[in-house]
Interface confidence: low
Amino acid sequence: HSDPARRGELSVCDSISEWVTAADKKTAVDMSGGTVTVLEKVPVSKGQLKQYFYETKCNPMGYTKEGCRGIDKRHWNSQCRTTQSYVRALTMDSKKRIGWRFIRIDTSCVCTLTIKRGR
Amino acid sequence: HSDPARRGELSVCDSISEWVTAADKKTAVDMSGGTVTVLEKVPVSKGQLKQYFYETKCNPMGYTKEGCRGIDKRHWNSQCRTTQSYVRALTMDSKKRIGWRFIRIDTSCVCTLTIKRGR
């Protein structure tokens, strides 16, 4: 997605993005909270497509691993957190049933705040 | 995805999430920057599946539309921005070729900073 640094902007939280294959992923959590196996390939009209996902998470090596950038530290504690979204994937559940389910994948790194209590 | 408010946390940027059908979406931008038509249904072994997407964007009505929450305003200007990610969708391009392509969808609302220059 578009890079804030190109516009002379900084992110409050540093993130990293990568393409993740089903082979790397192996399992995921579906919308009902169950663990499902992510199938490596999806049958399509002309054969098979490798199943993979674009994932974004907080950068564990980044400057912001200790807290978010630019926060008013007098009033707030902050933390960068990876958030998830749902994408449809071809999966097999624990009941050995194959089907398309929405699974959770990492899609962003956002900043969460907790108010500082009077010392 | 997990709700920070449940843990007594606030988001630096307020977001809204919704399920968007292909019928609502109609078109999208693929990875090469081209506009494609998003097909309403996907053929699967037992018939057809409605194609839809879980999208998250900045809340235009939220408190944070004027800037991010909790920022040190002495040093930074801030803005909440919708960021995008890629998901695979069955699409048709301008040459009427149908195929699975990665398209951009809104997946998060993050805070970007620009440093305040000396007044």
Partner: antibody, heavy 121, light 107 residues
Framework: DVQLVESGGSVVRPGESLRLSCAAS????????MSWVRQAPGEGLEWVSG??????????YYADSVKDRFTVSRDNSKNTLYLQMNSLRAEDTAVYYC????????????WGLGTLVTVSS | EIVLTQSPGTLGLSPGERATLSCRAS???????LAWYQQKPGQAPRLLIY???TRAAGIPARFSGSGSGTEFTLTISSLQSEDFAVYYC????????FGGGTKVEIK
């Protein structure tokens, strides 16, 4: 409290059809897999059919004994599970239970009281 | 299909006695995918035990399950009057199937 209430059972002739309903309450019906299990008079339990919840799309499964004759469906907006039974046979005579599947595997953590289907000429 | 055979068919015991119910599978059941249910006349079955030995919510500690492979056991350590019922085992390693049941009756 979880409640499952079956209805629609009656006496029918062989070859006829019947539709059973199961009204669910006390849990988020739409996300859970559901099943029908039957019990012939004086006999044990037999799993009949299952349908997946909204973690996936509503894919259906059947025991070999009812495949191509029975159809399971659900209406999440009404919190209701259905079993459409066609070409009924004498051996389909049983109490039919609606059961909520555990979210991990196919065992049943809640059951209804059942509805009796009698197939007799 | 996995066939489950329960024994004995009927078990006559007195309140306070220990009940041991057996469930044998026609082939080995993967992991611990076996459940036990209790059914009283005119009532729906009630889940007692799942994953061979885990008690379901609200089930008293006198009920316990054990076993692996093809041999599984439900034990009621000290029978109470409300425990006299029919008990079914069910495997869920494959498409679900039930045993024929064991009736626990007052001697």
């Amino acid at each position: 409290d979880v409640q499952l209430v079956e209805s629609g059972g009656s006496v029918v002739r062989p070859g006829e059809s019947l539709r059973l309903s199961c009204a669910a309450s006390g849990f988020t019906f739409s996300i859970y897999d559901m099943s029908w299990v039957r019990q012939a008079p004086g006999e044990g339990l037999e799993w009949v059919s299952g349908i997946r919840g909204s973690g996936g799309d509503a894919v259906t499964y059947y025991a070999d004994s009812v495949k191509d004759r029975f159809t399971v469906s659900r209406d999440n907006s009404k919190n209701t599970l259905y079993l459409q039974m066609n070409s009924l046979r004498a051996e389909d005579t049983a109490v039919y239970y609606c059961a909520k599947e555990n979210n991990r595997r196919i065992f049943f953590d809640y059951w209804g009281l059942g509805t009796l289907v009698t197939v007799s000429s | 299909e996995i066939v489950l055979t329960q024994s004995p068919g009927t078990l006559g015991l007195s309140p306070g006695e220990r009940a041991t119910l057996s469930c044998r599978a026609s082939r080995s059941i993967g992991r611990t995918y076996l459940a036990w249910y209790q059914q009283k006349p005119g009532q729906a079955p009630r889940l007692l035990i799942y994953d061979t030995s885990t008690r379901a919510a609200g089930i008293p500690a006198r009920f316990s399950g054990s076993g692996s492979g093809t041999e599984f056991t439900l034990t009621i350590s000290s029978l109470q009057s409300e425990d006299f019922a029919v008990y079914y085992c069910q495997q869920y390693d494959d498409w679900p199937s039930f045993g024929g049941g064991t009736k626990v009756e007052i001697k």
